[in-house]
Amino acid sequence: EVEKTACPSGKKAREIDESLIFYKKWELEACVDAALLATQMDRVNAIPFTYEQLDVLKHKLDELYPQGYPESVIQHLGYLFLKMSPEDIRKWNVTSLETLKALLEVNKGHEMSPQVATLIDRFVKGRGQLDKDTLDTLTAFYPGYLCSLSPEELSSVPPSSIWAVRPQDLDTCDPRQLDVLYPKARLAFQNMNGSEYFVKIQSFLGGAPTEDLKALSQQNVSMDLATFMKLRTDAVLPLTVAEVQKLLGPHVEGLKAEERHRPVRDWILRQRQDDLDTLGLGLQGGIPNGYLVLDLSMQEALS
């Protein structure tokens, strides 16, 4: 039976190199000095270790740094970062943007993992603020990260970062976040022509005010119903039937299927029935002909 715990003669690792891939897992444990590993972490990435061998190396680092790894080691973790748990990462103090970039690069192309979320959280807390460089880095790697920020944090997002945002990255944003992001997107895309501008701004329109929707209605944009349904109710209500018809273009027929849902339902209640009838969609619930419409909100403002 093989019962070895000490490093076999001649196997003590002098440096981290390719010869270690031949080592058994127990030999890595017994023959690789943790301090040597820590100083030569940058070499690990170039060596085709198995996942289990990486687990052994992680175990050695854990024993050397029970309170958490120093940043000099963290920056060179490479693929070993994928072996870290959120609990491991919570022990770290990451302050260098270069360290953050190096670790985000390892996870590039994948969804934001709990490890990455924890790393970003630790980084932001370590820095004490969300500066422009940090946000540029985070939105470059994870455009969807925007929706995880509070409206207060979003206020410091530079408009230039908005260019990296894909429509699906805003799926989890709530109206309060879109209220902050929309003006930035408007600014970022302001020099684009009409149709290109609409393609880019469309995902952010959940934060658009009434006047911007009115302006869009004059540009033959043909907004789809999915986008229309995400608009702020208070921004849609003042739109006239003619403006909604121009805004939606051929998609206006979709209003019938959505007449019981917000914001369509609330908008219908504000329109004259004879105006709704001009659409020929059979929309019901508008203000009957001959009724006087009092704008109570205006009356309150005047008093």
Partner: antibody, heavy 121, light 109 residues
């Protein structure tokens, strides 16, 4: 004398759960990597997974999510929790010990006698 | 890593030299074990580290190879050797289907 004894097998309905135990005697289980292997009637050996001495677990790709290996060193016992069982999980389940301490590096030198799990309605 | 074992079965006589091969889909260095299993019994480790004889195993069993190609040889088949033999790679246990080979059944000719 070094020995492994599995228990907890039996008849279970599809969709059900079962926890198998493997009690070790004659050695300290905490010093060894311990694995589970199964064998369907008339078929070959099929690896389920193993747990290292530092409690890292490794599973066959088909076992991930449904099967969980754990150990209780104080009871000198290793466990296999099986969930959402299917008819094709019917097999003799063996627990086994690595030759040396730490990780699976060489092979399983000590095997239990096996416990039969039958998944049927 | 996939393990391909051949032949799936073979018939031989007592005293014959028997060779079973195992091929790995990628380099596993010397990280290979061989087992013997008899009906109704648990497997028994024969060879570890591709060529090292496990404790109590007769010297007529030997293993060779490294990298991707491995061989188990029984120099002179004995009556108690009629059984099924399996190889197992122990290089990697992450994201694999089954580290065991499909088995070779040795029967009496």
């Amino acid at each position: 004398q070094v020995q492994l004894v599995e228990s907890g097998g039996g008849l279970v309905q599809p969709g059900g759960s079962l926890r198998l135990s493997c009690a070790a005697s004659g050695f300290s289980l905490s010093s060894y990597a311990m694995g589970w292997v199964r064998q369907a009637p008339g078929k070959g050996l099929e690896w389920i997974g193993y747990i290292s001495t530092i409690a890292n677990t490794y599973y066959a790709s088909w076992a991930k999510g449904r099967f969980t290996i754990s150990r209780d060193n104080s009871k000198n016992t290793v466990y296999l929790q099986m969930n959402s069982l299917r008819a094709e999980d019917t097999a003799v389940y063996y627990c086994a010990r690595e030759i040396r301490s730490g990780w699976v590096d060489y092979g399983f030198s000590i095997w239990g006698q096996g416990t039969l799990v039958t998944v049927s309605s | 890593i996939q393990m391909t074992q051949s032949p799936s079965s073979l018939s031989a006589s007592v005293g014959d030299r028997v060779t079973i091969t195992c091929q790995a889909s990628q380099n596993i260095y010397s990280n290979l074990a061989w087992y013997q299993q008899k009906p109704g019994k648990a497997p028994k480790l024969l060879i570890y580290d591709a060529s090292d004889l496990a404790s109590g195993v007769p010297s007529r069993f030997s293993g060779s190879g490294s990298g991707t190609d491995f061989t188990l040889t029984i120099s002179s088949l004995q009556p108690e050797d009629f059984a099924t033999y399996y190889c197992q790679q122990v290089r990697s246990s992450s994201d694999i289907d089954n580290p065991f080979g499909t088995g070779t059944k040795v029967t009496v000719l």
